[in-house]
């Protein structure tokens, strides 16, 4: 039975040209995290594997940095970066947990961080 929950940074906004940290946290389970995949809609951004470490997709290498922790840092943001991001936690023995973050990249300086929320 999967008992864990994913806590994410929820809906967030950031300024064009700036950077943002995408962060998820798995709690309420003793399952071992074997791998975390970060995806933007239907594109793989990065993978953090417990044995192999980080793999950043070549097309994102210039703008994506691993960490902090299992999170992901997006740099040199453009308006095209607006959209859904997913952290996919592969765990043993529970299976897969998925968290969702919505990022809005703004032209102006009115960007604010949204509240955290949980996805069971």
């Amino acid at each position: 039975m999967m008992t864990g929950t994913i806590e994410t940074t929820g809906n967030i906004s950031a300024e064009k040209g700036g950077s943002i940290i995408l962060q998820c946290h798995l709690s309420s389970t003793t399952a071992q995290v074997t791998q975390v995949n970060w995806e933007q809609q239907d594109q793989l951004l990065a993978i953090c594997n417990a044995d192999l470490g980080w793999h950043i997709s070549p097309s994102f290498k210039d703008r994506v940095a691993p960490g902090p922790g299992l999170g992901l840092t997006l740099q040199s943001l453009t308006v095209n970066d607006t959209g859904e991001y997913f952290c996919i936690y592969h765990t043993y023995p529970d299976g897969t947990y998925t968290g969702r973050i919505f990022l809005e990249v703004l032209e102006s300086s009115v960007a604010e961080h949204g509240a955290r929320f949980q996805i069971p």
Partner: antibody, heavy 118, light 107 residues
Framework: EVQLLESGGGLVQPGGSLRLSCAAS????????MHWVRQAPGKGLEWVAS????????GYADSVKGRFTISRDNSKNTLYLQMNSLRAEDTAVYYC???????????WGQGTLVTVSS | DIQMTQSPSSLSASVGDRVTITCRAS??????LNWYQQKPGKAPKLLIY???SLQSGVPSRFSGSGSGTDFTLTISSLQPEDFATYYC?????????FGGGTKVEIK
């Protein structure tokens, strides 16, 4: 240099058993998931089985479930496939393969031929 | 199980031609799609992973695109050593499944 060397193939009668081995070298074997993939003569590729880096998780194609067992010995850098109750349709070249991030197969062995025939 | 359908099953082309092979998944697989090249009597070789990432050491004339259910492998200018069979493979879920293959032959 990454090397995967399969052995143990050969001719076996229907209902018989074989154990394939795959000796790995040139990388940290214990860090990678490993798979077996087969190819019947003149046919396409078919995934057979997978095993996680620490052997905690295994998976099998429906066509071999209950008959084949994948295992590994990280101290010997070796992957195994125990094949029981073999059938004519199991005739194929069997490849062992390295799978980083449980995602893509970046290295394949040269393959070993298993022929099931009376 | 996720079915992978490749087209065409075979094609004839000349050196220098632009070649496109398509692969369709029976359900969305995000970008969990890989492409392999196989020559007779040899093991397959990884060309493209995660739909569009070029494997190290693979010539830049190979490219991949697509997401969801529809994917494409393109060879921008076919070379003599590219005549082979090409397979797509999904790794979104087990059982992992391959397309039926596309044989690229000399015209």
């Amino acid at each position: 240099e990454v090397q995967l060397l399969e052995s143990g193939g050969g001719l076996v009668q229907p209902g018989g058993s074989l154990r394939l081995s795959c000796a790995a070298s040139g990388f940290t074997f214990s860090s990678y998931s490993m798979h077996w993939v087969r190819q019947a003569p003149g046919k396409g590729l078919e995934w057979v089985a997978s095993i996680s880096s620490n052997a905690g998780t295994t998976g099998y194609a429906d066509s071999v479930k209950g008959r084949f067992t994948i295992s590994r010995d990280n101290s010997k850098n070796t992957l195994y496939l125990q094949m029981n109750s073999l059938r004519a349709e199991d005739t194929a070249v069997y490849y062992c393969a390295r799978v980083p991030y449980d995602y893509w197969i970046d290295y394949w062995g040269q393959g070993t031929l298993v022929t099931v025939s009376s | 199980d996720i079915q992978m359908t490749q087209s065409p099953s075979s094609l004839s082309a000349s050196v220098g031609d632009r070649v496109t092979i398509t692969c369709r998944a029976s359900q969305s697989i995000s970008s969990y799609l890989n492409w392999y090249q196989q020559k007779p009597g040899k093991a397959p070789k990884l060309l493209i992973y995660a739909a569009s990432s070029l494997q190290s050491g693979v010539p830049s004339r190979f490219s991949g695109s697509g997401s969801g259910t529809d994917f494409t492998l393109t060879i921008s200018s076919l070379q003599p050593e590219d005549f082979a069979t090409y397979y797509c493979q999904q790794s979104y879920s087990t059982p992992l499944t391959f397309g039926g293959g596309t044989k690229v032959e000399i015209k």
